[in-house]
């Protein structure tokens, strides 16, 4: 399977909400011995290898934000911790998974990474990630609403095995 990032750049005004999205593509094994671990984290834009370092989102680690389920099942993060920080990650039946961030501040700007780990019990793991940038802006140059920039077809299916 692959992870697609429909948008490579989100530009949002301060105070707005945004939902960053990744999509699981390709054949997904729905067997009982397969589960999917999905999560989000930030990574420094200065890194040579994109998404190689896992940094927190609003003080929450990738462990705090993870979803764990089988196949294309729907799932949401535990509400208490994430929602206290204005965050919610979710996954639907169609392979889409997202993180919603409320009341954006400039400090939310940066590179966001979605990670999917296919776990086959008693076998190996398969890891793929997608990356997108969020720029939060303020002042006269800031848009009135979030503006999204589509990934090129090559970028949108760009995957890296971890």
């Amino acid at each position: 399977f692959k992870v697609a990032t429909p948008y490579s750049l989100y530009v949002c005004p301060e105070g707005q909400n945004v939902t960053l999205t990744c999509r699981l593509l390709g054949p997904v094994d729905k067997g009982h011995d397969v589960t999917f671990y999905k999560t989000w984290y930030r990574s420094s834009r200065g890194e040579v290898q994109t998404c190689s370092e896992r940094r927190p989102i609003r003080n929450l680690t990738f462990q705090d934000l993870h979803l764990h389920h089988g196949g294309h099942q729907a799932a949401n993060t535990s509400h208490d911790l994430a929602q206290r920080h204005g965050l919610e990650s979710a996954s639907d039946h169609h392979g889409n998974f997202s993180i919603t961030m409320r009341n954006l501040t400039l400090l939310d700007s940066g590179l966001y990474c979605c990670l999917v780990v296919e776990i086959r019990h008693h076998h190996s793991e398969h890891r793929v990630h997608g990356a997108m940038e969020l720029q939060v802006q303020t002042g006269k140059d800031a848009p009135s609403n979030c503006v999204v920039y589509p990934s090129s077809s090559q970028d949108s299916e760009n995957i890296t095995a971890a």
């Epitope: 200065g46 939310d108 700007s109 940066g110 802006q137 800031a142």
Partner: antibody
């Protein structure tokens, strides 16, 4: 190694505008992080003035009542502070620093420059 | 905004002493960082994320705590450790500094 270096006049007259520049080497300020100004009045603690994100937007300490502007010169890899309508209360050592906004820490600092507001 | 209170505000100690500085937050915080500032110098990151030593910091420095109460400990004071120490909290999206603790030679 990331290095920051402040420069600017050490003496500013009351009601005038204080202008300082921070030159950064070893890292591109448009790559990542928040680039900040912090000051320390004589014998006192540290006060955050404001920061500019790598993407160009800035945020300021509300206590400075709109007197602050932080701007960037990407061609020289430096960012600047302007503080208008200064008074003796703005006398301080001014530091520029890199703010790691992932973990909320100031990981690299300039050596500081002393600015005295006096006629 | 979360307030940080350091205690003591000043402290006299001798070389070889074990010293503890505390930092209390007015409500729970995610991260605490500690800085050391010597006279005429910029602050230097000493300990980050409560207990991690910054690059080049000697192992005699340690940090601990959680929630609202945090400590910086120097296990055996060296002459170069006499300085002012600041704690700083990070609770997205705000940060604040403590008022500082001045460590002087007895």
């Amino acid at each position: 190694q990331v290095q920051l270096q402040e420069s600017g006049p050490g003496l500013v007259k009351p009601s005038e505008t204080l202008s300082l520049t921070c030159a950064v080497s070893g890292y591109s300020i448009t790559s990542d992080y928040a680039w900040t100004w912090i000051r320390q009045p004589p014998g006192k603690g540290l006060e955050w003035i404001g920061y500019m994100m790598y993407s160009g937007s800035a945020s300021y300490n509300p206590s400075l009542k709109g007197r602050v502007t932080i701007s960037v010169d990407t061609s020289k890899n430096q960012f600047s502070l302007k503080l208008s309508s200064v008074t003796a209360a703005d006398t301080a050592v001014y530091y520029c620093a890199r703010f790691d906004h992932y973990y909320g820490r100031f990981d690299y600092w300039g050596q500081g420059t002393t600015v005295t507001v006096s006629s | 905004a979360i307030q940080l209170t350091q205690s003591p505000s000043s402290l006299s100690a001798s070389v070889g002493d074990r010293v503890t500085i505390t930092c209390s937050a007015s409500s729970s915080v995610s991260y605490i960082h500690w800085y050391q500032q010597k006279p005429g110098k910029a602050p230097k990151l000493l300990i980050y994320e409560i207990s991690k030593l910054a690059s080049g910091v000697p192992s005699r420095f340690s940090g601990s705590g959680s929630g609202t109460d945090f400590t910086l400990t120097i296990s055996s004071l060296q002459p170069e450790d006499f300085a002012t120490y600041y704690c700083q909290q990070w609770n997205y999206p705000l940060f604040t500094f403590g008022q500082g603790t001045k460590l002087e030679i007895k």
